[in-house]
């Protein structure tokens, strides 16, 4: 029951996380204009991974895609790649984990297969979460660098006339969404990996030969590496041999202090 709950919760947490990663990737507010001094232009700039937007004080908003691919910073391309890899891995992980859920029956799928699928999806969620966190962190680092550079060269002039007013940009909402979503996906992945341990059937019965000695009569049968004295089910010295070998499950043997292995 605890395993099912852990797996189910891991799935839900990862689902929320991946939804958050997708939302963050699509959001336009990765960086927003720092309103340290509102100049004469009553306009507010903000940027996403895919387009740059501007909002007028009247409420009018206009966004434009980054039409050039080569003119963009390599770091931005890296962030895009990390976020997309995170989404793709997360989506595959979700697909795998649906079939791995203990509460869902698909044909005669064994627990070992479900355990493997749970582990696979868990690892995928962990990597997905790490990709998102890395992507957002790289962008945040770019922002911090740009912020301090802008502060240093706030005004650059030619002949005493102010030519450029460096606009400073600060963390947008998408960064926080991305960090939280990446963290949730990571936690969900860890939970799936923990659930996998509980799902995996513990192989304690190694199919081999078992000898049951009881009084004078000895029964030979294939089974686990178990040697038992006659303190089991045959205490009345009855003949066990019935002309055929039995499996471990057919003869009920109770553990005793004389059992080996």
């Amino acid at each position: 029951m605890a395993v099912t709950a852990c797996q189910g919760l891991g799935f839900v947490v990862s689902l929320i996380g991946i939804a958050g990663i997708i939302a963050a990737t699509c959001m336009d507010q990765w960086s927003t204009q720092d309103l340290y001094n509102n100049p004469v232009t009553a306009v507010f700039n903000y940027q996403g991974l895919w387009r740059s937007c501007v909002r007028e004080s009247s409420g009018f908003t206009e966004c434009r895609g980054y039409f050039t691919l080569l003119g963009l910073p390599a770091m931005l391309q890296a962030v895009r790649a990390l976020m997309i890899v995170g989404i793709v891995l997360g989506a595959i992980g979700l697909l795998v984990s649906i079939f791995a859920l203990k509460c869902i029956r698909i044909g005669s799928m064994e627990d070992s297969a479900k355990a493997n699928m749970t582990l696979t999806s868990g690892i995928m969620f962990i990597v997905s979460g790490l990709c998102a966190i890395a992507g957002v962190s790289v962008f945040a680092n770019m922002l911090v660098t740009n912020f301090w550079m802008s502060t240093a060269n706030m005004y650059t002039g030619m002949g005493g006339m102010v030519q450029t007013v460096q606009t400073r940009y600060t963390f947008g909402a998408a960064l926080f969404v991305g960090w939280v979503a990446g963290g949730l996906t990571l936690i969900g992945g860890v939970m799936m990996c923990i659930a996998c341990r509980g799902l995996a059937p513990e192989e304690t019965n190694y199919k081999a030969v078992s000898y049951h000695a009881s009084g004078h009569s000895v029964a030979y049968k294939p089974g686990g590496f178990k040697a038992s004295t006659g303190f089991g089910s045959n205490t009345k010295n009855k003949k066990i041999y019935d002309g055929g070998a039995r499996t471990e499950d057919e003869v009920q043997s109770y553990p005793s202090k004389h059992d080996y292995v």
Epitope: S52, C53, E62, Y66, T68, S150, T164
Partner: nanobody, 120 residues
């Protein structure tokens, strides 16, 4: 570095008209372009703004007489001023919120300004 250059200023009689031109060089992309003016001994004030989509905004006092337009192919913005008055005298500055090469963050770039003198 993005550079803006204004031209088209000069002296004109009251009631006359002028067309100011602003050209942006080395700008990868501009979120908007605008015109501002500074009358002698006064603060710089906003005149008009144009977005890449063609949407325009004007200062209330100038809406009727001023008209902003753009030519995206030439990276240029124009300000047509008609029925000019002596109080329109001042230096007209072009401003653009543009991205330089290799950046995603626009900065406010300003031109050197062009002088407009309206005599009565």
């Amino acid at each position: 570095q993005v550079q803006l250059a204004e031209s088209g200023g000069g002296s004109v009689q009251a009631g006359g008209s002028l067309k100011l031109i602003c050209t942006a060089s080395r700008a990868t992309d501009c979120n908007y372009m605008s015109w501002h003016r500074q009358a002698p001994g006064k603060e710089r004030e906003f005149v008009s703004r144009i977005f890449p989509s063609g949407k325009t905004t004007y200062a209330d006092s100038m809406k009727a007489r001023f008209s902003i337009s753009q030519d995206n192919a030439k990276n240029s913005v124009y300000l047509l001023m008609v029925n000019l008055k002596p109080e329109d005298t001042g230096k007209y500055y072009c401003q653009g919120s543009c991205r330089g090469p290799g950046s995603i963050w626009p900065s406010d770039y300003w031109g050197q300004g062009t002088q407009v003198t309206v005599s009565s």
